[in-house]
Each structure stands twice: as structure tokens, then as C-alpha cells.
Interface confidence: low
């Protein structure tokens, strides 16, 4: 906290401009009116304030708006957003997509911070729903955000958003989430040819039903074992030995190393020994 001191004569700020970068912290505290700051927040980012000076400006806004900043101020926070704590952000009511975009832009290129996670939570609560525009914005900044949504929230994700998703963004998705995302991915990629389609759909196959796995087995896709191990057990069980052999192609030999793990273990137990023997891997049903 900055000690309360009177503003020196002639130093009272009439507007937020570059002259303020020469003010000491106590001078900013004493000479900048919080209401003036609030109405001219859009100028702050154009001025090379130090982090210490920004702390003072934040303190002034906190005093002016103890119940939380209005959206007119929030939209123009810019780099001052990086000074906010999740506790600060929980007081906000953010409803404008422009405000959300402006603040996500500040954090662009960085991982999702607790501040950003709280901001998004406040925004979604303020809007009352996850509409297409919101989801397009969030997936553009954080494709991995999909996996932090509940299956119910994911149901409103437009298939067009799926194109932004990279394989690593789905690493943390639960089976229930993939159950919702897979049909959307299938729809999004439906006009691609066989090999390109498989490359795109591969990450989502943890939500694929048996009939789609059977169809893939007819397309020489050569699924790797890592992908196979993430498939739904109930989707794998009805597959025949011949279908699994076609699905995995040259990777079928990897079944031996995974024979004690689901879904391979459960699948083996469902097969006739004669059929397993045709693989020549020594699998015991």
C-alpha cells in the first residue's frame, strides 16, 4: 500500500498521459483521480508504466470499485489484467464477448492461468450459456479448453470448432467427453478422403462405436497401439480377430505386449482360441 500524501502543487493529473510515467508511486496515488483513471483506462496500455506503477493504478481502481469493476473498465484493462487475482475477477460480471477477447489477447501465447480460468468461468456464468461465438473464441485461444468442459457443456460445441483441435489437446479428455466430441468430429471431417480422415479422427476415436471401428478396419488405416488402447472397451469387444488384424495392420504384433491390459485383455477373453492362433502371437483366451 502507498502512504496517503497530499499531491504536490501543479502535479494534479488532468488526463492519463505519458507525463505520468515520471511520477513516483506516491505521486500517482496522490495526484491521479480514480474516476479519471476509470474513464480513461483505454490510454493506460499505450503508456509504458512500470509494474510498480501499475500496482498503484490497480489499487486506485480497487478503492473506487470495492464490489468489482464495471465492464466498461474491465474491457480496457489490457496489461493491468495480469495484475488481477482470481479473487478480484470473481467479483466481475463479464457479458461482452469483446471484453473476453480483449483480455484473452493479453494472455495470448501463455498457458491458461488461474486468472484466465476464472475469467472464462465468470463469462460463461454471466452469459448463462456456451453459445457458438463463445466456444469459437475459447477454442481459438485455448483448443485444450474443450477437455475442461463437462459433457453437458460440450454438447453445444459446434462441429466447426473441432477443426482447431490438435491431438495433444485431447490427452486429458475423459471417455465421457470423447463420447460427445467424437460424433462432432465425424461430422466435421466427413468430406475428407480415407487416409486424411483417419489422421484427423484418430484423436477422437475414444468415443467411437463398434460399427465405426468395423468400417475403419476395411480402410487399411494401420491404427497404432496407443490409439487402440484408448478405445472404448465396449466398442472393441464385438470386433472379430480378422477385424482387429485389419484395423491394426502391421501394429497387430503389439497386442502381445498389451495382453494384460484393457481393452486388449477383455477382447482376448471374448475370442475363440482357434481365431487367436491365426495371429501367431501366442495370445491365450
Amino acid at each position: 500500500e502507498v502512504e496517503k500524501t497530499a499531491c504536490p502543487s501543479g502535479k494534479k493529473a488532468r488526463e492519463i498521459d505519458e507525463s505520468l510515467i515520471f511520477y513516483k508511486k506516491w505521486e500517482l496515488e496522490a495526484c491521479v483521480d480514480a474516476a479519471l483513471l476509470a474513464t480513461q483506462m483505454d490510454r493506460v496500455n499505450a503508456i509504458p508504466f512500470t509494474y510498480e506503477q501499475l500496482d498503484v493504478l490497480k489499487h486506485k481502481l480497487d478503492e473506487l470499485y470495492p464490489q468489482g469493476y464495471p465492464e466498461s473498465v474491465i474491457q480496457h484493462l489490457g496489461y493491468l489484467f495480469l495484475k488481477m487475482s482470481p479473487e478480484d475477477i470473481r467479483k466481475w460480471n463479464v457479458t461482452s464477448l469483446e471484453t473476453l477477447k480483449a483480455l484473452l489477447e493479453v494472455n495470448k501465447g501463455h498457458e491458461m492461468s488461474p486468472q484466465v480460468a476464472t475469467l472464462i468461468d465468470r463469462f460463461v456464468k454471466g452469459r448463462g450459456q456456451l453459445d457458438k461465438d463463445t466456444l469459437d473464441t475459447l477454442t481459438a485461444f485455448y483448443p485444450g479448453y474443450l477437455c475442461s468442459l463437462s459433457p453437458e457443456e460440450l454438447s453445444s460445441v459446434p462441429p466447426s470448432s473441432i477443426w482447431a483441435v490438435r491431438p495433444q489437446d485431447l490427452d486429458t479428455c475423459d471417455p465421457r467427453q470423447l463420447d460427445v466430441l467424437y460424433p462432432k468430429a465425424r461430422l466435421a471431417f466427413q468430406n475428407m478422403n480415407g487416409s486424411e480422415y483417419f489422421v484427423k479422427i484418430q484423436s477422437f476415436l475414444g468415443g467411437a462405436p463398434t460399427e465405426d471401428l468395423k468400417a475403419l478396419s476395411q480402410q487399411n488405416v494401420s491404427m497404432d497401439l496407443a490409439t487402440f488402447m484408448k478405445l472404448r472397451t465396449d466398442a472393441v469387444l464385438p470386433l472379430t480377430v480378422a477385424e482387429v488384424q485389419k484395423l491394426l495392420g502391421p501394429h497387430v504384433e503389439g497386442l502381445k505386449a498389451e495382453e494384460r491390459h484393457r481393452p486388449v485383455r477383455d477382447w482376448i477373453l471374448r475370442q475363440r482360441q482357434d481365431d487367436l492362433d491365426t495371429l501367431g502371437l501366442g495370445l491365450q483366451g
Epitope: M112, P114, A117, T118, D121, C147, S148, L149, S150, P151, E152, E153, T172, C173, D174, R176, Q177, R262
Partner: nanobody
């Protein structure tokens, strides 16, 4: 009341190992997904590893795969993180978390209701 207490942090040289523990009390530990998160200096919170109550299908963030192992002992109400081949970029405050919100990803930072106070791991030569 629910309490999560982490321990096992410290200073270790690159390539070294540490084992973090998280002791839980005040909840039926065996029925909860539990996870490790970390926050490096000046960085955001990051999910490291998570283990569901079934103790199957553990999840790891890419940067620790093959080096870190998450495990749990339900009889002791304790979560562990075995960290091998430590690197400077593993330096962080490590937190355990539990009471996962239904439907959220196991490594989502907004996915847990209960958090520990953290234990500091410093990897430095």
C-alpha cells in the same frame, strides 16, 4: 473438515529424484480422483498427473511422461508422485487436489474443489 497436506519437496540436482506425498483427511479418499498440479515461478497453474479412484487410466501432461509416476495408497489415504530424471523446468510449487467436479477433465485447473497448500521443488545444480 477436508485437509490435503503435501510433503517431500526440496532441492535436488538435475537428473535426481524426489517422491512427493499428499496425505488426505476428512473425506472418503478411495472414492475420489486425485491429481498433482504445479505452478512454476511466474507461470500459470499446470496439471501434472491425475489418477482416478479406480487407479486405472492415469493421465500425465506430455512434459513428464516417462519420468513421473502417480500412485495412491487408499489404505493410508495418501497420494504419491515419484519424480525421476528431474529437470530445471520442473522447479515449481506442487499442489495436490481432489473432489473433482463431475465431467471435468482430470487435469483441468478448474476441475477440483479441494486443494493442498503446496510443497516446493527446486531443481538446480
Amino acid at each position: 473438515q477436508v485437509q490435503l497436506v503435501e510433503s517431500g519437496g526440496g532441492v535436488v540436482q538435475p537428473g535426481g529424484s524426489l517422491r512427493l506425498s499428499c496425505a488426505a483427511s476428512g473425506l472418503s479418499f478411495s472414492t475420489y480422483t486425485v491429481a498433482w498440479f504445479r505452478q512454476a515461478p511466474g507461470k500459470g497453474l499446470e496439471g501434472v498427473a491425475a489418477i482416478p479412484y479406480t487407479s486405472q487410466h492415469m493421465v500425465y501432461t506430455d512434459s513428464v511422461k516417462g519420468r513421473f509416476t502417480i500412485s495412491r495408497d487408499n489404505s493410508k489415504n495418501t497420494l504419491y508422485l515419484q519424480m525421476n530424471s528431474l529437470r530445471a523446468e520442473d522447479t515449481a510449487v506442487y499442489y495436490c487436489a481432489t473432489d473433482r467436479r463431475p465431467g471435468t477433465s482430470m487435469l483441468a485447473i478448474n476441475g477440483y474443489n479441494r486443494w493442498g497448500q503446496g510443497t516446493t521443488v527446486t531443481v538446480s545444480s
